[in-house]
């Protein structure tokens, strides 16, 4: 299928997700994160497992990856910890956290996301944020500038359908809506923000892009709390 | 730096195949998806298609579909352009070049001539 | 697909000179134009991107402008180095395609 990208959004206002991250391999984009604290980084666990030979950096504050930007800075990675259940198979349990070697300098462009504690399903229909450096288009066009989607949570159930993702949603992970607007790949480890608050990351195993009845899947930090604050502790 | 090393030249019957190389150095390979353009003598670009060397996924220009098939070896950091039922209409220069930023093809090999002739 | 088309073939001009190449798109192209100059040899380099983005290494003489269908690269204070053919490139529709070209000679 087409590697992951935002499909159907448009270019994001400069600097207004001030906890958006690119996690860099060797100096290219490779996946999207989310700053949770000032020395964390959230992402997908799949983002890292191509990545043994290679640098792994995080850019913080930046709203085009090519052009300089005053708040934009890049941080080495200290400490890379893959949820320890997640697989290269599996969707399952794809969450990653990132130890800067510093703690962000924070500042209206770099600014840590509140993250949902509560374990609890978003209402279906509710209009979520997705925002990513994916590719936009088929023949992998790469946006320089943050690209972001509006999307409608999808209910399990219907995600489960056997014409969609026949029984692999969990309670672990959440579904939006795929028709032509969509995150795939691309944006793997990036963030679904519903009111304001960290919901889902989005997950990084290969799908058809921008078809209804492939949804896009999220993992949900809720149901990770524990893991989340054990790292960060 | 970045470098992409394409061979001269190439030259071949009609009705037959060829391979063209295209071998890339001095950054990550799987990370840039890899363009093929084609220059017949005098003219402009044509842009054939696509490669993303990471999963081998290829997107073709409808018009060169059936007569270019794209292929990489990550081992080696090449991608690969095969053509096939050679014609006269085939002649041309065939340049690879690196996915840049919005569309744009950020570094060009030298480009190979391929002739095609009996 | 998408038409672009570079109206004038053939530019003369002197060292030192400011010009300007243009470049027409059959259609809205949002902004997704692209500049590339090839030398006699045929080198290709990228020279501007979205559309007034300069690439990396690209020396500052060298700026672009546009939306929508209409777009332009302007060379100011030409260079020795700088007489070579210009096309432009829409990234925003597949299948890709370049405008005709546009070759700038020494007068």
């Known amino acids: 299928p087409p590697r992951g990208r935002i499909l159907g959004g448009r270019e994001a206002e400069a600097h207004a997700r001030p906890y958006m991250a690119s996690v860099q391999l060797n100096g290219a984009h490779l996946c999207g994160g989310v700053l949770v604290a000032e020395q964390w980084v959230l992402s997908a666990a799949h983002c890292l497992e191509d990545a043994a030979d290679g640098k792994v950096q995080v850019l913080l504050g930046a709203h085009s990856l090519s052009q300089p930007e005053p708040s934009k800075r890049l941080y080495d990675v200290l400490r890379a910890v893959p949820h320890p259940d997640s697989q290269p198979d599996t969707i399952d349990h794809d969450l990653l956290l990132l130890q800067l070697s510093e703690k962000a300098t924070l500042g209206p462009a770099v600014r840590p996301l509140p993250w949902q504690r509560v374990d609890r399903d978003v209402a279906p229909g509710t209009l979520c944020d997705v925002a990513g450096w994916g590719i936009v288009n088929h023949a992998g066009r790469r946006p320089d500038s943050l690209q972001h989607v509006l999307l409608p949570v999808l209910d399990r159930a219907t995600c489960n359908r056997r014409t969609h993702h026949d029984g692999a949603i969990t309670e672990r992970l959440m579904c939006a809506e795929s028709n032509r607007r969509d995150s795939c790949k691309g944006d793997s480890g990036g963030p679904l923000v519903c009111g304001g608050v960290l919901e889902g990351v989005v997950t990084s195993g290969s799908r058809v892009c921008g078809n209804r009845k492939k949804p896009g899947i999220y993992t949900r930090v809720a149901s990770y709390a524990a893991w989340i604050d054990s790292v960060l502790a | 730096q970045v470098q992409l090393q394409q061979p001269g030249a190439e030259l071949v019957r009609p009705g037959t195949s060829v391979k063209l190389s295209c071998k890339a150095s001095g950054y990550t390979f799987t990370s840039y998806w890899m363009h093929w353009v084609k220059q017949r003598p005098g003219q402009g670009l044509e842009w054939i298609g696509v490669i993303d060397p990471s999963d081998s996924y290829t997107y073709y220009n409808q018009k060169f579909k059936g007569k270019a098939t794209l292929t990489v070896d990550t081992s080696s950091s090449t991608a690969y352009m095969q053509l096939s039922s050679l014609t006269s209409e085939d002649s041309a220069v065939y340049y690879c070049?690196?996915?840049?930023?919005?569309?744009?093809?950020?570094?060009w090999g030298q480009g190979t001539s391929v002739t095609v002739s009996s | 697909e998408i038409q672009m088309t570079q109206t004038t073939s053939s530019l003369s001009a002197s060292l030192g000179d400011r010009v300007t190449i243009s470049c027409r798109a059959s259609?809205?192209?949002?902004?997704?134009l692209n500049w590339y100059q090839q030398k006699p040899d045929g080198t290709v380099k990228l020279l501007i991107y979205?559309?007034?983005r300069l690439h990396s290494g690209v020396p500052s003489r060298f700026s672009g402008s546009g939306s929508g269908t209409d777009y332009s690269l302007t060379i100011s204070n030409l260079e020795q180095e700088d007489f070579a053919t210009y096309f432009c490139?829409?990234?925003?529709?597949?299948?890709?395609?370049f405008g005709g070209g546009t070759k700038l000679e020494i007068k």
């Open positions: 259609q809205d192209i949002s902004n997704y």
């Open positions: 979205y559309p007034s």
């Open positions: 490139q829409q990234g925003n529709t597949l299948p890709y395609t």
């Open positions: 070049a690196r996915n840049g930023y919005d569309g744009a093809m950020d570094y």
